[in-house]
Interface confidence: low
């Protein structure tokens, strides 16, 4: 014969547990039932009576199976610097996440306590990393033969254009300006020629995904160990 | 006030490693990189890598294979750790805070520490 | 790796006098920075993006360059400008330094 099903509550066999979505209620000594998601215990369980669950008020929510006497406060309205990714509801809190163009400076359990703005690139640097949602934009200044002549917080250091005849050499922040003959840019996707005469033999490619830079003309390191690039000579 | 702040060991037996934490104030470790940076008789100043804001480590080259250095945002501090010491490694360690948005100049610099590696 | 030249190596001026002092790389670079040591002090920023003048540093000093050759200029030496002066580059990894140049006052 199967076992009898114990219904809530019962007393549990000598050194036993209670089973799922049940807790042991110390002054009762009973196992009793647990409330769900969006309810709390609004009456606790007695020898003879199965604890009694009541619906979380407006504000307040509970995210898991639950004994707890009141529901837990929604967090505050999200500041003018985040935008609502998640509504406060009976069973989840509010969750705050930063706006485009913003960081999280200092992240909570969920959400985010303090959004930053995104560092922008002179004239002069580009993007070397990215911002994440949890991490500042890092600018790099640009390296000879390419450049940057925007304030950015996503433009990369570009290739100078490579002209027949240089009417005025780029530098870092400006384009090189060709005579009227048309420039000729060479320019394949992910592969960029760099006028002579730069040295690229210790510049390494850049460690963040597309969009990329041309090779070379980084000057950050892979990150963590790794082999030089090939060609590098390693002096 | 921007501070920043090396402590190490002082002394370390040759093979072993140095461990040196660098605790910095006044700024927060996810809006700059920290450098690392010895100085000795012999060779002068000599980079050694960095820690991004990021969380993002670059190493020099000639370090790479036995240097690691990692952060914890929420204490404000610098770990960083060198493998394989010998006696050249003899040198004052710096930590340095470097300018993620864009100056790159490490503008402030911890007091250092020595580091003597003997027997 | 892009090896930096100092030179002179040493160098003593009297007060008033003009000081260039220069900074050689082995390849071409975006920008120079300089910082000032004294004895028993950690290094200062002292000229960052080649020719801006850090924090604190008077206008008699100033610094110019491009490519491979870059120079540090006091218009007229004072005595607390006795200290050694690095020049450093980050075009390309590893980030390197020059050997540095003594400036002593007369």
């Known amino acids: 014969l199967p076992a009898q099903v114990a219904f809530t509550p019962y007393a549990p066999e000598p050194g036993g547990t209670c089973r799922l979505r049940e807790y042991y209620d110390q002054t009762a000594q009973m196992c009793c039932s647990k409330c769900p998601p969006g309810q709390h215990a609004k009456v606790f369980c007695t020898k003879t009576s199965d604890t009694v669950c009541d619906s979380c008020e407006d504000s307040t929510y509970t995210q898991l199976w639950n004994w707890v006497p009141e529901c837990l406060s929604c967090g505050s309205r999200c500041s003018s610097d985040q935008v609502e990714t998640q509504a406060c509801t009976r069973e989840q809190n509010r969750i705050c996440t930063c706006r485009p163009g913003w960081y999280c400076a200092l992240s909570k359990q969920e959400g985010c306590r303090l959004c930053a703005q995104l560092r922008k690139c002179r004239p002069g640097f580009g993007v070397a990393r990215p911002g994440t949602e949890t991490s500042d934009v890092v600018c790099k200044p640009c390296a000879p033969g390419t450049f940057s002549n925007t304030t950015s917080s996503t433009d990369i250091c570009r290739p100078h254009q490579i002209c027949h005849v240089v009417a005025i050499p780029g530098n870092a922040s400006m384009d090189a300006v060709c005579t009227s003959t048309s420039p000729t840019r060479s320019m394949a996707p992910g592969a960029v020629h760099l006028p002579q005469p730069v040295s690229t033999r210790s510049q390494h490619t850049q460690p963040t995904p597309a969009p990329s830079t041309a090779p070379g003309t980084s000057f950050l390191l892979p990150v963590g160990p790794s082999p030089p690039a090939e060609g590098s000579t390693g002096d | 006030e921007v501070q920043l702040q090396e402590s190490g060991p002082g002394l370390v037996q040759p093979s072993q490693s140095l461990s040196i934490t660098c605790t910095v104030s006044g700024f927060s470790l996810t809006s700059y990189g920290v450098h690392w940076v010895r100085q000795s008789p012999g060779k002068g100043l000599e980079w050694l890598g960095l820690?991004?804001?990021?969380?993002?480590?670059d190493y020099s080259a000639a370090f790479i294979s036995r240097l690691s250095i990692n952060k914890d945002n929420s204490k404000s501090q610098v770990f960083f750790k060198m493998n394989s010491l010998q006696a050249d490694d003899t040198a004052i360690y710096y930590c340095a805070r470097n300018d993620d948005g864009g100056d790159y100049v490490m503008d402030y610099w911890g007091q250092g520490t020595t580091v003597t590696v003997s027997s | 790796e892009i090896v930096l030249t100092q030179s002179p190596a040493l160098m003593s001026a009297s007060p008033g006098e003009k000081v260039t002092m220069t900074c050689s790389a082995s390849?071409?670079?975006?920008?120079m920075y300089w910082y000032q040591q004294k004895p028993r002090s950690s290094p200062k920023p002292w000229i960052y993006l080649t020719s801006n003048l850090a924090s604190g540093v008077p206008a008699r000093f100033s610094g110019s360059g491009s490519g491979t050759s870059y120079s540090l200029t006091i218009s007229s030496m004072e005595a607390e400008d006795a200290a050694t002066y690095y020049c450093q580059q980050w075009t390309s990894n590893p980030l390197t330094f020059g050997a540095g140049t003594k400036l002593e006052i007369k």
């Open positions: 390849s071409s670079v975006s920008y």
């Open positions: 820690i991004w804001s990021d969380g993002s480590p």
